[in-house]
């Protein structure tokens, strides 16, 4: 009765971002069913002929899987029974970006939800004092970013100050010819101050802080994905 389509079930996805070359997760949950054998999960991608992944009768069914996803996908099989249809995606590629559909069939009915998946590269910056420089200088480095981000320096003491005139940022293409290493140097640094190096593109925003005093140096970094509720 449910499978005939007279009932719809709630399926929920979360927009997310994948880091190129790393493993990612496309999140999807649904109203659980009591019998695993009654649950069918299909992941589809807009513009792709074959399936991204299919799970039915308690196991993967990859006969219709598109070649671009071969050997790269898995659901959390032990969590399907509790309503987790999230997809693990190995070795995220730039071309994995797009609109995905999480389609669920259970004995209660059918349901689906779309998910926007962005791909790029993002990494934590590290800020250090550059002792090789002639004046007090800070060096902010982050190994992998794509698309090319913006880099902005800020200071706790000089809030609102524009450091673009006293900083220099360079982008160096990494060996795989997609992602880039970000290096930004800030000159004329004063002691007893906290400086922040903020790197941002349309996927992520990362900040590296450094507090420089006469007696110690303290560092802190954090990274936040944008347009994602995760």
């Amino acid at each position: 009765f449910g499978i005939s389509g007279r009932h719809s079930i709630t399926v929920t996805t979360v927009a997310s971002a994948g880091n190129i070359g790393e493993d990612g997760i496309l999140s999807c949950t649904f109203e659980p069913d009591i019998k695993l054998s009654d649950i069918v999960i299909q992941w589809l991608k807009e513009g792709v002929l074959g399936l991204v992944h299919e799970f039915k009768e308690g196991k993967d069914e990859l006969s219709e899987q598109d070649e671009m996803f071969r050997g790269r996908t898995a659901v959390f099989a032990d969590q399907v029974i509790v309503g987790n249809a999230s997809l693990r995606l190995k070795n995220v590629q730039l071309t994995d970006a797009g609109t995905y559909k999480c389609y669920i069939i259970t004995s209660k009915g059918k349901g689906n939800a779309n998910l926007e998946y962005k791909t790029g590269a993002f990494s934590m910056p590290e800020v250090n004092v550059d002792y090789n420089a002639s004046s007090e200088t800070l060096r902010c480095e982050a190994p992998r970013w794509f698309p090319q981000p913006t880099v902005v320096w800020a200071s706790q003491v000089d809030q609102g100050a524009n450091f673009s005139e006293v900083s220099n940022t360079s982008f160096e293409l990494n060996s795989e010819n997609v992602t880039m290493k970000v290096v930004s140097v800030l000159y004329n640094v004063t002691i007893n101050n906290t400086y922040s190096c903020m790197i941002e593109n349309d996927i992520a925003k990362a900040t590296g802080d450094i507090k420089v005093t006469e007696s110690e140096i303290k560092r802190r970094s954090h990274l936040q994905l944008l347009n994602s509720k995760a």
Epitope: G21, E22, D60, L62, S63, E67, G71, A77, K90, N91
Partner: antibody, heavy 120, light 107 residues
């Protein structure tokens, strides 16, 4: 438990085609969460992944061997096979078949292996 | 293709001692790495997958660690049956590739 067994000629002449079959017992080759792979090991050397097949017949081959390799499956016999054409002495190796996870893609279990010597 | 490099080529260890084997990937493979044990005349046996998850039936003395490009297999206290050749394998991208192996021999 699941077992794999390789079979085929132990001696192949240069320029001919090497043919091996892997018979799966203790489980179905149609188990959806797995691929079925071939790996080889020249005497005293390391391991080289040859390629894999899904029960539906879709294959993926190592680019270094792609022009010479064919992997096929016979679900009715619970078997999959390897053909390697235009062999040379460099293809002399122990050939293993193995079950390969769809992801993670580890090999487990393996067949015991069969030595194929290429010589005239 | 991703090149896997294992070191050392040979490791001489006394029974009961700890053995640490290294595997390095030419580019990041995330945690998509497996370790195998091979004894003479036998097929390889899966020990670890996902860089750190022990396969079914593998004793707790075997542990794997690392991610990205640097990985380690540790055997906490070598038993006589552990003397063998150990291979790492990346399954991050096709073609899947193996390291050249580390032979663990009795000192």
């Amino acid at each position: 438990q699941l077992q794999l067994q390789e079979s085929g000629p132990g001696l192949v002449k240069p320029s001919e085609t090497l043919s091996l079959t892997c018979t799966v017992s203790g489980g179905s080759i149609k188990s959806g969460s797995y691929y079925w792979g071939w790996i080889r090991q020249p005497p005293g050397k390391g391991l080289e992944w040859i390629g894999n097949i899904y029960y539906s017949g879709s294959t993926y081959y190592n680019p270094s061997l792609r022009s010479r390799v064919t992997i096929s499956v016979d679900t009715s016999k619970n078997q999959f096979s390897l053909k390697l054409s235009s062999v040379t002495a460099a293809d002399t190796a122990v050939y293993y078949c193995a079950r390969e996870g769809s992801y993670p893609n580890q090999f487990d279990p393996w067949g015991q292996g069969t030595l194929v010597t290429v010589s005239s | 293709e991703i090149v896997m490099t294992q070191s050392p080529a040979t490791l001489s260890v006394s029974p009961g001692e700890r053995a640490t084997l290294s595997c390095r990937a030419s580019q990041s493979v995330s945690s998509n790495l497996a370790w195998y044990q091979q004894k003479p005349g036998q097929a390889p046996r899966l020990l670890i997958y996902g860089a750190s998850t022990r396969a079914t039936g593998i004793p707790a003395r075997f542990s794997g660690s690392g991610s990205g490009t640097e990985f380690t297999l540790t055997i906490s206290s070598l038993q006589s049956e552990d003397f063998a050749v150990y291979y790492c394998q990346q399954y991050h991208s096709f073609p899947f590739t193996f390291g050249g192996g580390t032979k663990v021999e009795i000192k």
